[in-house]
Amino acid sequence: NKILVKQSPMLVAYDNAVNLSCKYSYNLFSREFRASLHKGLDSAVEVCVVYGNYSQQLQVYSKTGFNCDGKLGNESVTFYLQNLYVNQTDIYFCKIEVMYPPPYLDNEKSNGTIIHVKGKHLCPSPLFPGPSKP
């Protein structure tokens, strides 16, 4: 028995930040779980982790240097990533493990979300004016 995960196929991070919502076919209310976001086709980099516990507030952390936060819904976890770099454009996969109460459940691998990080647009300097309007 596997949890199904839905993600947006693609997101664009215009200001180096993005909200990625992971929607699950499972209600996380009153469960103890570990939701995580992984970068790359091989999911080699664990970008962000959200630990949910029925009796404590959400624990959110990254061991890989990402600036992240998390928000919990009944059947979703939203990861808010900030200070992304252009070279962090990649495919990102949501993962969920429900530990308690048993039985242990995890998800079928999702299709992932391509996060396209656009560089910050700098205001044109007066010495180097941008293209003039017609």
């Epitope: 103890e32 570990r34 493990e97 530990m99 308690y100 109460p101 048993p102 039985p103 242990y104 995890d106």
Partner: antibody
Framework: EVQLVESGGGLVQPGGSLRLSCAAS??????????VGWIRQAPGKGLEWIGE???????YYSPSLKSRVTISRDNSKNTLYLQLNSLRAEDTAVYYC????????????WGQGTLVTVSS | DIQLTQSPSSLSASVGDRVTITCRAS??????????LHWYQQKPGKAPKLLIY???SLQSGVPSRFSGSGSGTDFTLTISSLQPEDFATYYC?????????FGQGTKVEIK
């Protein structure tokens, strides 16, 4: 046949660290369906759950020990490890690893245990 | 944390006696009709051995004189006819919530 064999116990100084091993055979630590936990028993006392590791590598710890404990594994050796830091006399115990199934989380196979004595 | 309280802490019995040990949880350990409460037997110098899982299911290889019952917060381990090899300490354990917790144990001694 499922077997769990702990090693690494002995005398440790207060403030020191211990690293215990649990060699598993008869099943794979990285295959779904089962996980492995660590449980300890102080001399003449009851059983205390330390933490566990799932096939995915995710770990779960007892809140009272979380700041001092790390459970890890080496899939190539099918071996589990328990690292416990800042040891004190109260950590003196027999340390067991035990396998649990994912449906009920009952510990169906146990190692023989390894004794750790924390003393100067 | 879920506290498990076993009673009695110790008991003296004779071979052939019917023995009952109770385990009370500080909150329900039931979920979707399953009680996540297990019983173990431990002999001196040995590792615990699983006897009963999910409150009433007999672990493979365990003699049928052992049985478990109960749901919610109140559970019972019964040994229908005590045998010499049954003198040991018995523990209940819950796996409904983390941290997993054990009862303090019940020592069954020879009368």
């Amino acid at each position: 046949e499922v077997q769990l064999v702990e090693s690494g116990g002995g005398l440790v100084q207060p403030g020191g660290s211990l690293r215990l091993s649990c060699a598993a055979s008869g099943f794979s630590l990285s295959t779904g369906g089962v996980g492995v936990g660590w449980i300890r028993q102080a001399p003449g006392k009851g059983l205390e759950w330390i933490g566990e590791i799932y096939h995915s590598g995710s770990t779960y710890y007892s809140p009272s020990l979380k700041s001092r404990v790390t459970i890890s594994r080496d899939n190539s050796k099918n071996t589990l490890y328990l690292q416990l830091n800042s040891l004190r006399a109260e950590d003196t115990a027999v340390y067991y690893c035990a396998r649990y199934g994912y449906y009920y989380y009952d510990f169906d196979y146990w190692g023989q245990g390894t004794l750790v004595t924390v003393s100067s | 944390d879920i506290q498990l309280t076993q009673s009695p802490s110790s008991l003296s019995a004779s071979v052939g006696d019917r023995v009952t040990i109770t385990c009370r949880a500080s909150q329900s350990v039931d979920f979707h009709g399953i009680s996540f409460l297990h019983w173990y037997q431990q002999k001196p110098g040995k590792a615990p051995k699983l006897l009963i899982y999910a409150a009433s299911s007999l672990q493979s290889g365990v003699p049928s004189r052992f049985s478990g019952s109960g749901s919610g917060t109140d559970f019972t381990l019964t040994i229908s006819s005590l045998q010499p090899e049954d003198f040991a300490t018995y523990y209940c354990q819950q796996s409904y919530r983390s941290p997993r917790t054990f009862g303090q144990g019940t020592k069954v001694e020879i009368k």
